[in-house]
């Protein structure tokens, strides 16, 4: 049902990464423009990218106000310049998205090393904190402030003049490794929520070598 | 408001099992760890394990690995502690705890109100 | 399995200040130990005062703060009332189990 020439959308897509979310769907309009309307389960709904030909919303002020709720959205589909039609029943003609619990699916983001150093045959790697768009007594939250303990990181090491791999892991943002004297190390990291069933893993970091700006050589 | 209510006292003879329910409300059920700690008459506090019932993601204390098990029922809000081969040492008063919003604040938030465990033969 | 200790018993004078702390046998206390403080008073349930080391529940007064004070966590009272008088446990996180203390009895008197 539904007015003439409108089709309501399909596909409705959660696209998340560290809390920044965006609702997409398709298809694009013609001559057809869209809202979405966003709840939690116990909720009002809160409409959103009103009357928009886009075909995604940015919903993120929505769910970082509480990242740990469940959250449903829905798509109304309205005839172009007519947006008081309605369907047959009285209603425009909507779709609703599967069901979103940021703390639980958003993506990880790429995490960045941000220094290391070295100290005799010891190797400090520090991992950036990003910030998130979680805020808390109007301050933004870390990505550990968020997840605190649920969140790990696992460190790829290996010798520059070879190919064998070695792993750590973290449950804070350094690491303190054990490395040979005189070999240049290269270092990759990745964030991991252990817990998890879905989107339990970020893409690896960028590699960083010893030897290049970012690190710090002390011969002790 | 975020409320645990657990089940009610239990005998059970050595080598019996018991299995202890926590119902949740006020909050989202799939988003929180929930904590098992026990105290037995005139002890401290000991956690047993955790589970995070959006993913039945559970950890465990390693005293009670092989004995304990911790289940989440989504459609009822509830969270289950069954521990096996009871013997006279586990007679406790059992707690369900939620944690805090967020991860800088991890750990215990609030707290059931306990079920007494009395292993007698 | 890490030991977590602290004082078996302390007494502070009503109105006064007292420190309880929390040791780790595996080194310093850090911020990613997440340190709890749970109060139990006789008869009664646990009630988490500060968790992740010096963030006060709701329901916690402002004469208790929790902090990192050298290589130990401690919890500070300020002002100290016949309530407080309790069982006072320390709870830290070390990579996938939580360990209890002992528990520190505070006598008000």
């Known amino acids: 049902s539904g007015t003439t020439n409108t089709v309501a959308a399909y596909n409705l897509t959660w696209k998340s990464t560290n809390f920044k979310t965006i609702l997409e769907w398709e298809p694009k309009p013609v001559n057809q423009v869209y809202t979405v309307q966003i709840s939690t389960k116990s909720g009002d709904w809160k409409s959103k990218c009103f009357y928009t030909t886009d075909t995604e919303c940015d919903l993120t002020d929505e769910i970082v106000k509480d990242v740990k709720q469940t959250y449903l959205a829905r798509v109304f589909s309205y005839p172009a310049g007519n947006v008081e039609s309605t369907g047959s029943a009285g209603e425009p003609l909507y779709e609703n998205s599967p069901e979103f619990t940021p703390y639980l699916e958003t993506n990880l983001g790429q995490p960045t090393i941000q220094s290391f150093e070295q100290v005799g045959t010891k190797v400090n790697v520090t991992v950036e904190d990003e910030r998130t768009l979680v805020r808390r007594n109007n301050t933004f939250l870390s990505l550990r402030d968020v997840f605190g303990k649920d969140l790990i990181y696992t460190l790829y090491y290996w010798k520059s003049s070879s190919s064998g791999k070695k792993t750590a892991k973290t449950n804070t943002n350094e690491f303190l490794i054990d490395v040979d004297k005189g070999e240049n190390y290269c270092f990759s990291v990745q964030a991991v929520i252990p817990s998890r069933t879905v989107n339990r893993k970020s893409t690896d970091s960028p590699v960083e070598c010893m030897g290049q700006e970012k690190g710090e050589f002390r011969e002790i | 408001q975020v409320q645990l209510q657990e089940s009610g006292a239990e005998v059970k003879k050595p080598g019996a099992s018991v299995k202890v329910s926590c119902k949740a409300s006020g909050y989202t059920f799939s988003s929180y760890w929930i904590e098992w700690v026990r105290q037995a008459p005139g002890q401290g506090l000991e956690w047993m394990g955790e589970?995070?019932?959006?993913?039945?993601?559970?950890k465990y204390n390693e005293k009670f690995k092989g004995r304990v098990t911790m289940t989440a029922d989504t459609s009822t809000n509830t969270v289950y502690m069954e521990l096996s081969s009871l013997r006279s040492e586990d007679t406790a008063v059992y707690y369900c705890?939620?944690?805090?919003?967020?991860?800088?604040?991890?750990?215990?938030?609030?707290w059931g109100q306990g079920t007494l465990v009395t292993v007698s033969s | 399995q890490a030991v977590v200790t602290q004082e078996p018993s302390l007494t502070v004078s009503p109105g006064g200040s007292v420190t309880l702390t929390c040791r780790s046998s595996?080194?310093?206390?850090?911020?990613?130990?997440?340190a709890n403080w749970i109060q139990q008073k006789p008869g009664q349930g646990p009630k988490t005062l500060i968790s992740?080391?010096?963030n006060r529940g709701p329901w916690t007064t402002a004469r208790f703060s929790g902090s990192i004070l050298g290589d130990k966590a401690v919890l500070t009272l300020w002002g100290a009332h016949a309530e407080d008088e309790a069982d006072y446990y320390c709870?830290?996180?070390?990579?996938?189990?939580?360990?209890f203390g002992g528990g520190t009895h505070l006598t008000v008197q």
């Open positions: 709870a830290l996180w070390y990579s996938n189990h939580w360990v």
């Open positions: 589970i995070l019932p959006g993913s039945a993601s559970t």
């Open positions: 992740g080391t010096n």
């Open positions: 705890a939620r944690d805090y919003y967020y991860g800088s604040s991890y750990g215990f938030a609030y």
């Open positions: 595996t080194g310093a206390v850090t911020t990613s130990n997440y």
